[in-house]
Amino acid sequence: MAVTACQGLGFVVSLIGIAGIIAATCMDQWSTQDLYNNPVTAVFNYQGLWRSCVRESSGFTECRGYFTLLGLPAMLQAVRALMIVGIVLGAIGLLVSIFALKCIRIGSMEDSAKANMTLTSGIMFIVSGLCAIAGVSVFANMLVTNFWMSTANMYTGMGGMVQTVQTRYTFGAALFVGWVAGGLTLIGGVMMCIACRGLAPEETNYKAVSYHASGHSVAYKPGGFKASTGFGSNTKNKKIYDGGARTEDEVQSYPSKHDYV
């Protein structure tokens, strides 16, 4: 029951996280005009990964896409790539995890296969979350660097009579959405990996020897679950028994439909 709950919760958390990563990637407010010195501005600038926007205080908003590909900063391209990789991995992870959910029965899919898929989706969610966090962090670092550079320019370029106000940019809402979403996806992935460890023992936590129906060959299994991950084909259609010696863990285990040849 706890395994099902952990897996289900991991799936839901990852789903929310990936939705957040998609939202952050699409948002226009990755960087917003710094209003520290001028809280009320007649023209407000903000930028996303795909376009930059200007909102005038009268209500008019105009956005322009970055129609060039080669002319964009390499860092921006890298952030785009990281976010897209995160979304793609997350989407595939979601697809895999749907089939891996313990509460969903698909044909005669074995628990070992479900455990395998749960681990795979968990790893995908972890990488997806890391990609999003990395992408957002790279962009944030770029903003911090540019912020202090423009601040330095502001105070060195005041010699003339005519003032040219340089626009400084600070963290936009999309960065916080991205960080939170990446974190949630990461947490969801970890939960899926934990659930996978709970799924696998159902088939492989019987200890001692492996007994074939023919009764001619006997293979001794010394380590039980700790010696074998349960993802190999050696567990398929085999009766695993313990000769009467049960561990505390095994008291709760019941035969699955593949335990008998």
């Epitope: 005009q33 009320v40 501005t41 007649a42 023209v43 600038n45 903000y46 930028q47 930059s52 926007c53 200007v54 005038e56 205080s57 009268s58 209500g59 008019f60 105009e62 322009r64 005519v162 003032q163 040219t164 106000v165 340089q166 626009t167």
Partner: antibody, heavy 118, light 113 residues
Framework: QVQLQESGPGLVKPSETLSLTCTVS?????????WNWIRQPPGKGLEWMGY???????NYNPSLKSRITISRDTSKNQFSLKLSSVTAADTAVYYC???????????WGQGTLVTVSS | DIVMTQSPDSLAVSLGERATINCKSS????????????LTWYQQKPGQPPKLLIY???TRESGVPDRFSGSGSGTDFTLTISSLQAEDVAVYYC?????????FGQGTKVEIK
């Protein structure tokens, strides 16, 4: 096309409060515009006084900030100007105007002359 | 506040001739976000409210004759009437639309010589 019409008393006594209303037709006051008050003393230039925007936020000229209030009544499709403690220097033609793209005043009322005199 | 200074204060031009009005701002009106200059030009005829001619320094408002054109960037701007007509006699104002409070130039009176 949006049309604007100012209304209010043409004569106000010094130290009293000047109150004007602008009625909007051909458009909603809740639409994505800013609704401004601009004044022009006789024979002089234009002075922007302040606005109330589509979301109800106001912004005033600092030179008038302590005396000015702009509000709106969405049910009547009107917005209003209140200017307290008036003096003879506040005698002017008062215009209401709509600003949008480029923060430019695209529609104007005909203007109403307000004289401050005892 | 941004101070807008127009020159000349008045201008007499023959019909069909070119009229040029200058406007200088005390700060740059160029917005780096969209590379647009937030300067607007208005025409005001006697007894009438001002009429929008040009916004973003060079974009003509719909319905405005193409003899009116705006140019300039940063702090220096120009309104040009390529061929002055009798109906162009008016006072012309430039406006800072970039920074609060929005401010106007003192106006330039255009007359026929």
């Amino acid at each position: 096309q949006v049309q604007l019409q100012e209304s209010g008393p043409g004569l106000v006594k010094p130290s009293e409060t000047l109150s004007l209303t602008c009625t909007v037709s051909g458009g909603s006051i809740s639409s994505n515009y800013a609704w401004n008050w601009i004044r022009q003393p006789p024979g002089k230039g234009l002075e922007w006084m302040g606005y109330i925007n589509y979301s109800g936020n106001t912004n005033y000229n600092p030179s008038l900030k302590s005396r000015i209030t702009i509000s709106r009544d969405t049910s009547k499709n009107q917005f209003s100007l209140k200017l307290s403690s008036v003096t003879a220097a506040d005698t002017a033609v008062y215009y209401c105007a709509t600003s949008y793209y480029g923060n430019s005043f695209i529609y104007w009322g005909q203007g109403t002359l307000v004289t401050v005199s005892s | 506040d941004i101070v807008m200074t127009q020159s000349p204060d008045s201008l007499a031009v023959s019909l069909g001739e070119r009229a040029t009005i200058n406007c200088k701002s005390s700060q740059s009106l160029l917005n780096s976000g969209n590379q647009k200059n937030y300067l607007t030009w208005y025409q005001q005829k006697p007894g009438q409210p001002p009429k929008l001619l040009i916004y973003w320094a060079s974009t003509r408002e719909s319905g405005v004759p193409d003899r009116f054109s705006g140019s300039g960037s940063g702090t220096d701007f120009t309104l040009t009437i390529s061929s002055l007509q009798a109906e162009d006699v008016a006072v012309y104002y430039c406006q800072n639309a970039y920074s609060f409070p929005w401010t106007f130039g003192q106006g330039t009176k255009v007359e026929i010589k």
